[in-house]
Interface confidence: medium
C-alpha cells in the first residue's frame, strides 16, 4: 500500500493546487519559463526554471519549498541539463504540469 507523502511534499502539492485553483489574472503577468524534463531531478530542475521569475508573490512560497527539496544551491540563470532545449511555457502551465507530474508519482503503486 502506498504511503502518503512527507509533510513537506504534501504542502508543496497543496500549494500547487492552491495556485492552479485560485488563479484569476494571468499568473506572474504571463511570464515565460523554461520547460523541463519531468523524468528525473524534478525539484532542482523546477527550481532552476522558476527562480528566474522575480517579483511574483504567487509563486514565492513554491520557490521556497522547491529550494528545500533541492540539495544544491540554485541561482538565477543556471542552466539545467533537464531543461527542454529552447522551449518556454507560461508559469501557469509550468505549475500545472508540475502538479500533474507529482500527482502521477503518488498514484503509481496505488492504481493498477
Amino acid at each position: 500500500s502506498p504511503v502518503p507523502p512527507s509533510t513537506a511534499l504534501k504542502e508543496l502539492i497543496e500549494e500547487l493546487v492552491n495556485i492552479t485553483q485560485n488563479q484569476k489574472a494571468p499568473l506572474c503577468n504571463g511570464s515565460m519559463v523554461w520547460s523541463i524534463n519531468l523524468t528525473a531531478g524534478v525539484y532542482c530542475a523546477a527550481l532552476e526554471s522558476l527562480i528566474n521569475v522575480s517579483g511574483c508573490s504567487a509563486i514565492e512560497k513554491t520557490q521556497r519549498m522547491l529550494n528545500g527539496f533541492c540539495p544544491h544551491k540554485v541561482s538565477a540563470g543556471q542552466f539545467s541539463s533537464l531543461r527542454v532545449r529552447d522551449t518556454k511555457i507560461e508559469v501557469a502551465q509550468f505549475v500545472k504540469d508540475l502538479l500533474v507530474h507529482l500527482k502521477k508519482l503518488f498514484r503509481e503503486g496505488q492504481f493498477n
Epitope: 502506498p2 502518503p4 502539492i13 500527482k103 503518488f106 498514484r107 496505488q110 492504481f111
Partner: antibody, heavy 119, light 107 residues
Framework: QVQLVQSGADVKKPGASVKVSCKAS????????IHWVRQAPGQGLEWMGA????????AYNQKFKGRVTMTTDTSTSTAYMELRSLRSDDTAVYYC????????????WGQGTLVTVSS | EIVLTQSPATLSLSPGERATLSCRAS??????LHWYQQKPGQAPRLLIY???QSISGIPARFSGSGSGTDFTLTISSLEPEDFAVYYC?????????FGGGTKVEIK
C-alpha cells in the same frame, strides 16, 4: 459548481449485476480520482474502491475484488461502478465521491443510488 | 487494514452543550484523518480534513484535533441542525476505512 449526479434507484434479483453511473460537472474530470462508497440500511460507510480517470487505473477493496469493475468515460465525464453476482447483503445506497489524491478527503459526494437486491 | 474505532456509539446531549467525539486508529496515521457529518437520507458532508483543517462554509463551532492514533471532533455548542451521525475516515493507506460512526442525538 461541482456536482456529482448519480443514476436512479434500481431493484435487482440475486445473482444479477448492477451498473451505477456518476456524472461529474463543475471541474476538470481527469484531475480527480473517483471513489465509490456504499452504505447498507442503518449501517456505516464502506469504501469499495477507486479509479483514476486519467489512466483508467483502479484500486479495489479486497472484499469486492472479482465482483466489482470501475470505469470512466472521459468524453462525458462519467464514472461507472458495476457490481456482479449480487446478494441480498449488497442492498445499500452507493455513493460516488471525488478525491484529488487518495490521502485527501472526499470533498464532494453524489446524492447516492439505492440498489435493492431481492428475489 | 487500518481499523478506526469511534466512541461513544451514541451521544445524548441538549442544544447548547459541548460534544466531544473520539476516533482511535489501530496504527499511526499521522494527520491523515477526515471527519464527515451525515443526516438521514443525505450523503455525508466533509467537516474537517487532515485531523484539524477547517472547511470553508462549515461553522466555526466544529473543530478537530489529534495526530497519530487518537483524534477528536469537538462541537463547541450544539445547534439543532448538528444532531446527526459523524464518521471519521482513514486517508493514510488502502483500503480507505471509516469508523463505525457516532450518533449525536437530542437528550
Amino acid at each position: 459548481q461541482v456536482q456529482l449526479v448519480q443514476s436512479g434507484a434500481d431493484v435487482k434479483k440475486p445473482g444479477a449485476s448492477v451498473k451505477v453511473s456518476c456524472k461529474a460537472s463543475g471541474y476538470t474530470f481527469i484531475d480527480y480520482e473517483i471513489h465509490w462508497v456504499r452504505q447498507a440500511p442503518g449501517q456505516g460507510l464502506e469504501w469499495m474502491g477507486a479509479i483514476d480517470p486519467e489512466t483508467g487505473g483502479t484500486a479495489y477493496n479486497q472484499k469486492f475484488k472479482g465482483r466489482v469493475t470501475m470505469t470512466t468515460d472521459t468524453s462525458t465525464s462519467t464514472a461507472y461502478m458495476e457490481l456482479r453476482s449480487l446478494r441480498s447483503d449488497d442492498t445499500a445506497v452507493y455513493y460516488c465521491t471525488r478525491i484529488l489524491l487518495y490521502y485527501y478527503p472526499m470533498d464532494y459526494w453524489g446524492q447516492g443510488t439505492l440498489v435493492t437486491v431481492s428475489s | 487494514e487500518i481499523v478506526l474505532t469511534q466512541s461513544p456509539a451514541t451521544l445524548s446531549l441538549s442544544p447548547g452543550e459541548r460534544a466531544t467525539l473520539s476516533c482511535r486508529a489501530s496504527q499511526n496515521i499521522s494527520d491523515y484523518l477526515h471527519w464527515y457529518q451525515q443526516k438521514p437520507g443525505q450523503a455525508p458532508r466533509l467537516l474537517i480534513y487532515y485531523a484539524s483543517q477547517s472547511i470553508s462554509g462549515i461553522p466555526a463551532r466544529f473543530s478537530g484535533s489529534g495526530s497519530g492514533t487518537d483524534f477528536t471532533l469537538t462541537i463547541s455548542s450544539l445547534e439543532p441542525e448538528d444532531f446527526a451521525v459523524y464518521y471519521c475516515q482513514n486517508g493514510h493507506s488502502f483500503p480507505l476505512t471509516f469508523g463505525g460512526g457516532t450518533k449525536v442525538e437530542i437528550k
